[in-house]
Amino acid sequence: MASAGMQILGVVLTLLGWVNGLVSCALPMWKVTAFIGNSIVVAQVVWEGLWMSCVVQSTGQMQCKVYDSLLALPQDLQAARALCVIALLVALFGLLVYLAGAKCTTCVEEKDSKARLVLTSGIVFVISGVLTLIPVCWTAHAIIRDFYNPLVAEAQKRELGASLYLGWAASGLLLLGGGLLCCTCPSGGSQGPSHYMARYSTSAPAISRGPSEYPTKNYV
């Protein structure tokens, strides 16, 4: 019963992580313009994402522009896009694997096969979490490096956007949820050996010994 609870908690966390990851990838708030030095009332703030950039005027009006050419984009941005999409697809695959092996489904009957599928889904979610973490950390590193680089002009300096924090949250939830699903498996998998023992005992010779004849030291 406890393992079922952990499984549910694990899958809820991974679902939250997936939604966070989707929002993080979609929002154009990976990089935010940083105005430093002389205190200035800035007329506009620029947000940059993986798919578009937006200019927010002091009036609150926002204009967004989708990036035109894929090939003209910087390689790190292309890589971040790819990893984001792959991470989301991997997490979806993990969810399908989990559903196939969940305690409440009948896709797979055998308990050990179910446990193996849940373990696999957990590993897949962990992989998805790592894949989410890579572009987020890479982008954050680039922003921080440029911020403190004296050669970079102030107009080119950026700050960490909300999407990066969402990305970290998404990654954490996917890793935690995936980890929980991996942890539920020993209890699910322990059904396996006793199941095989039962099968084995049916094919054992009819002559059986009394309980006292088994060496007790073999029992834990």
């Epitope: 105005f35 430093i36 030095g37 002389n38 200035i40 800035v42 007329a43 680089n149 004296p150 050669l151 970079v152 002009a153 102030e154 107009a155 080119q156």
Partner: antibody, heavy 120, light 107 residues
């Protein structure tokens, strides 16, 4: 007193390369970025690029990429600019200039200039 | 690239007159503007940074003003030693760009 001492005038043939130096004194060389500026005869100033003496990182004006290469020698607190494949268009006065500290990124100290003449 | 435009290429002014040199950026440069003075045969000398801050050792007759795209260098009472070419430069965005220069001469 902050001083930037540049190498003397150069007369070179088209197609050749030249390396101009800028020896600094009076401040900690690695704490400020060093930039180079071109001034063609009777014309305005053009920023070529800059280098961070601390780690050798460089930034270039797109116009001068492939033309100029910036380097430093920390041991002698000297900045260098190499110009390659020279043409008459490269004939100008070249200045090294120190860029100010945090929040004041203008060019606060300049070298006296190096006159480059490209002629056959 | 940000274009810096100095509308007048030269001024001929009487001694002790007020001189006003204008500089216009093609986009907002958020006060990241410097003014330089260059005398013939010499390297440029920084006069004003941050659009308004006078550098140490620069006479108080020099002053800078402006914001956004439009900036001004003023010399309240022109002296003979002020005969030079004045350049504005934006250091907001790379590549850093200079104005075409304004030559100040005495009538």
């Amino acid at each position: 007193e902050v001083q930037l001492q540049q190498s003397g005038p150069e007369l070179v043939k088209p197609g050749a390369s030249v390396k101009i130096s800028c020896k600094t004194s009076g401040y900690t060389f690695t704490e400020y970025t060093m930039h180079w500026v071109k001034q063609s005869h009777g014309r305005s100033l053009e920023w070529i690029g800059g280098i961070n003496p601390n780690n050798g990182d460089t930034i270039y004006n797109q116009k001068f990429k492939g033309k100029a290469t910036l380097t430093v020698d920390k041991s002698s607190s000297t900045a260098y600019m190499e110009l390659r494949s020279l043409t008459s268009e490269d004939s100008a006065v070249y200045y090294c200039a120190r860029r100010g500290g945090y929040g004041n990124f203008n060019f606060d100290y300049w070298g006296q200039g190096t006159t480059l003449t490209v002629s056959s | 690239d940000i274009q810096m435009t100095q509308s007048s290429s030269s001024f001929s002014v009487s001694l002790r007159d007020r001189v006003t040199i204008t500089c216009k950026a093609s986009e907002d440069i958020y006060n990241r503007l410097a003014w330089y003075q260059q005398k013939p045969g010499n390297a440029p000398r920084l006069l004003i940074s941050g659009a308004t801050s006078l550098e140490t050792g620069v006479p108080s007759r020099f002053s800078g003003s402006g914001s956004g795209k439009d900036y001004t260098l003023s010399i309240t009472s022109l002296q003979t030693e002020d005969v030079a070419t004045y350049y504005c430069q934006q250091y907001w965005s790379s590549p850093y760009t200079f104005g075409g220069g304004t030559k100040v001469e005495i009538k």
